[in-house]
Amino acid sequence: MAVTACQGLGFVVSLIGIAGIIAATCMDQWSTQDLYNNPVTAVFNYQGLWRSCVRESSGFTECRGYFTLLGLPAMLQAVRALMIVGIVLGAIGLLVSIFALKCIRIGSMEDSAKANMTLTSGIMFIVSGLCAIAGVSVFANMLVTNFWMSTANMYTGMGGMVQTVQTRYTFGAALFVGWVAGGLTLIGGVMMCIACRGLAPEETNYKAVSYHASGHSVAYKPGGFKASTGFGSNTKNKKIYDGGARTEDEVQSYPSKHDYV
């Protein structure tokens, strides 16, 4: 029961986490910037992985996509890749974990198969969560290192004067969504791995010994029964009867839990 609960909870937590990773990847607010905040109008700029937006206090918002790939920093491309890998791994993990759920029966799937699938999905969730956390952390690092030292920098450009104004980029909501979502996916993956241990079928810790009566008269040797149980000195299950009684090792090469003494 506890295993089913752990597996189910792990699945739900991972599902929420992956939904969060998808949401964070699509969000525009990875970095935010206050451009003006005067009595006339307040203008904010926020940038995501795919486009940049300008929003005014009036409610007007204009977004433009990063149409060129070549002009974008390698770090942004790396963050995009990490987030996409995280989503893909998470989605595959979810698909695998659905079939691995103990509460869902599919044909005559054995517990060992379900255990393997649970472990696989758990590992996928862990890697997915780590990808998301890494991606968001790389972006956050970009923001921290991107603050310009100079307050204003004047230079002459094409068609007149150009002035650079220092505007600080701060952490956007998407970063926090990404961190939390990545963490949830990671926790969900760990829970799935824990559940996998409980799902794995226990192996028998005893050796069964079978006795086969023969047509000939069996000569009883004293101490034979004690030795044959496996608890005495005869632990190697050596042959102690002259007749038809044989050890399990000699009769069957693959003992199973369905053999009875």
Epitope: V43, S58, W148, G157, V165
Partner: nanobody, 121 residues
Framework: QVKLEESGGGLVQAGGSLRLSCAVS????????MGWYRQAPGKQRELVAT???????SYSDSVKGRFTISRDNAKSTVYLQMNSLKPEDTAVYYC???????????????WGQGTRVTVSS
């Protein structure tokens, strides 16, 4: 590289009208605000009018009711319709655009070369 190109300046009689236009070209992410400033001979550059992409406008007291700023977001162009011109409106009119050039780049204030407006009495 971003370029601002003004046009429409010239000589006009007092009480007359002129329409200035300024087009922004080049590679950039977002234009935040666009506006017009002017500099009369021997004076400081002063704000005439500005507009945001959303249509919020502001005017200097000296031109309120006479000048109208408008924009065409699709063409990244700003216009200044000047009516009831006075001799004191004589100046070089500069186009201004606050632009975000690229990803995580700082806001840059771009200025045009200026177009001369002369109002004769």
């Amino acid at each position: 590289q971003v370029k601002l190109e003004e046009s429409g300046g010239g000589l006009v009689q007092a009480g007359g009208s002129l329409r200035l236009s300024c087009a922004v070209s080049g590679n950039f992410l977002n234009i935040v605000t666009m506006g017009w400033y002017r500099q009369a001979p021997g004076k400081q550059r002063e704000l005439v009018a500005t507009t945001t992409r959303g249509g919020s406008t502001s005017y200097s007291d000296s031109v309120k009711g006479r000048f109208t700023i408008s924009r065409d977001n699709a063409k990244s162009t700003v216009y200044l319709q000047m009516n009831s011109l006075k001799p004191e409106d004589t100046a070089v009119y500069y186009c201004n655009a606050d632009i975000i050039p690229g990803f995580l780049q700082q806001l840059t204030v771009h200025w045009g070369q200026g177009t001369r407006v002369t109002v004769s009495s």
